[in-house]
């Protein structure tokens, strides 16, 4: 007769949902062209948006130095306010927590106050999302 103790059988959670994307260029009045440098990310990029599959709180980190002064917003759902918004900045180094749910998509909107440029160049552009509630509802 075999006996298993609860401590010996860890719950089989899927890997923690997380992603690190980079961006080197943004388009005025549109978004930033984001790419994931790693093939091993547990979250995916689609149409310059990060797809949310799991409900829960996410740690969000955003960094970058911009070639022009701009206003930048990070959105998660059409018709909803931004996760955060920055006005007339040349750099960003922000961290926060937000509740996101299945079917949400995280994406940028940027606008410059100059009509001289269609695109904004970015040094050190990086967006990181890390799910904080493993074991919660996920749909793939």
């Amino acid at each position: 007769c075999l006996h298993f103790y609860a401590s010996q059988v860890p719950p089989q959670y899927p890997p923690i949902q997380s992603i690190r994307v980079q961006f080197t260029r943004c388009e005025n009045e549109k978004g930033c062209i984001i790419t994931s440098p790693s093939k091993d990310e547990t979250m995916k990029v689609q149409d310059n948006s990060i797809i949310i599959n799991c409900d829960g709180f996410y740690l969000i980190s955003l960094k970058g130095y911009f070639s022009e002064e701009l206003s930048l917003s990070l959105y998660y759902r059409k018709g909803r306010g931004p996760l955060f918004s920055l006005s007339k900045v040349t750099s960003v180094d922000s961290i926060g927590v937000a509740y996101l749910a299945f079917k949400d998509k995280v994406y940028f909107n940027v606008t410059t106050h100059s009509t001289s440029y269609k695109d904004i160049q970015v040094n050190g552009g990086e967006l990181i999302l890390i799910h904080q509630n493993p074991g919660g509802f996920c749909a793939y």
């Epitope: 080197t24 130095y65 695109d119 160049q121 040094n123 050190g124 552009g125």
Partner: antibody, heavy 118, light 106 residues
Framework: EVLLMESGGDLVKPGGSLRLSCVAS????????MYWIRQAPGKGLQWVSQ????????NYADAVKGRFTISRDNAKNTLYLQMNSLRDEDTAVFYC???????????WGQGTLVTVSS | SYVLTQPPSKNVTLKQPAHITCGGD??????VHWYQQKLGQAPVLIIY???SRPTGIPERFSGANSGNTATLTISGALAEDEADYYC?????????FGGGTHLTVL
């Protein structure tokens, strides 16, 4: 400390080719736009070319378009400038540059001299 | 293509203010960066985004930009400020430098 070190400058005949290199250290090379800027003897500064951190976007000055190619190897922290069909007017000190902000050149190398002459 | 116009040379008396101009069509809508280059040396960024000063650049250097003119001001010029000064902007996908101004400190 940020260091940019150019090499590859030489005396070359008109129509010839040359490849410049710039090794970078002291900052996250792969995250930064990189630039080549030149200065003809006794003249002012002239922007030549630029490349984005991931290498996906490049731009060139009209004077070098179609003749020069900028590239980078992020694994080696190295920026390159391949120069073909060189002309007398390409004679200059070539600097590689970068910075915290794109297009604000806070980091410069010491320069490498390219002389085009028959 | 976009043109930036600087006076080729400028004289200033020691410890007096110096103003170096950079003209361009509606330059006030662009971000202007300024560089100092001493003889035989690489340029040094002294002002970025019109008026911001990098770490290590003395407070006597300042910048302004509006309309068709950007201005670099040295509040009290020292002998060590004798150099060439260049303005620079991004225009579309290119970067453009002014022709440079040689500042002589008398």
């Amino acid at each position: 400390e940020v260091l940019l070190m150019e090499s590859g400058g030489d005396l070359v005949k008109p129509g010839g080719s040359l490849r410049l290199s710039c090794v970078a250290s002291g900052f996250t090379f792969s995250s930064n736009y990189m630039y080549w800027i030149r200065q003809a003897p006794g003249k002012g500064l002239q922007w030549v070319s630029q490349i984005s951190g991931d290498g996906s976007f490049t731009n060139y000055a009209d004077a070098v378009k179609g003749r020069f190619t900028i590239s980078r190897d992020n694994a080696k922290n190295t920026l390159y400038l391949q120069m073909n069909s060189l002309r007398d007017e390409d004679t200059a000190v070539f600097y590689c540059a970068s910075g915290i902000y794109p297009n604000a050149f806070g980091y410069w190398g010491q320069g490498t001299l390219v002389t085009v002459s028959s | 293509s976009y043109v930036l116009t600087q006076p080729p040379s400028k004289n200033v008396t020691l410890k007096q203010p110096a103003h170096i101009t950079c003209g361009g069509d509606n330059i006030g809508s662009k971000s202007v960066h300024w560089y100092q280059q001493k003889l035989g040396q690489a340029p040094v960024l002294i002002i970025y985004y019109d008026s911001s000063r990098p770490t290590g650049i003395p407070e006597r250097f300042s910048g302004a930009n509006s309309g068709n003119t950007a201005t670099l001001t040295i509040s009290g010029a020292l002998a060590e400020d004798e150099a060439d000064y260049y303005c620079q902007v991004r225009d579309s996908s290119a970067n453009v430098f002014g022709g440079g101004t040689h500042l002589t400190v008398l």
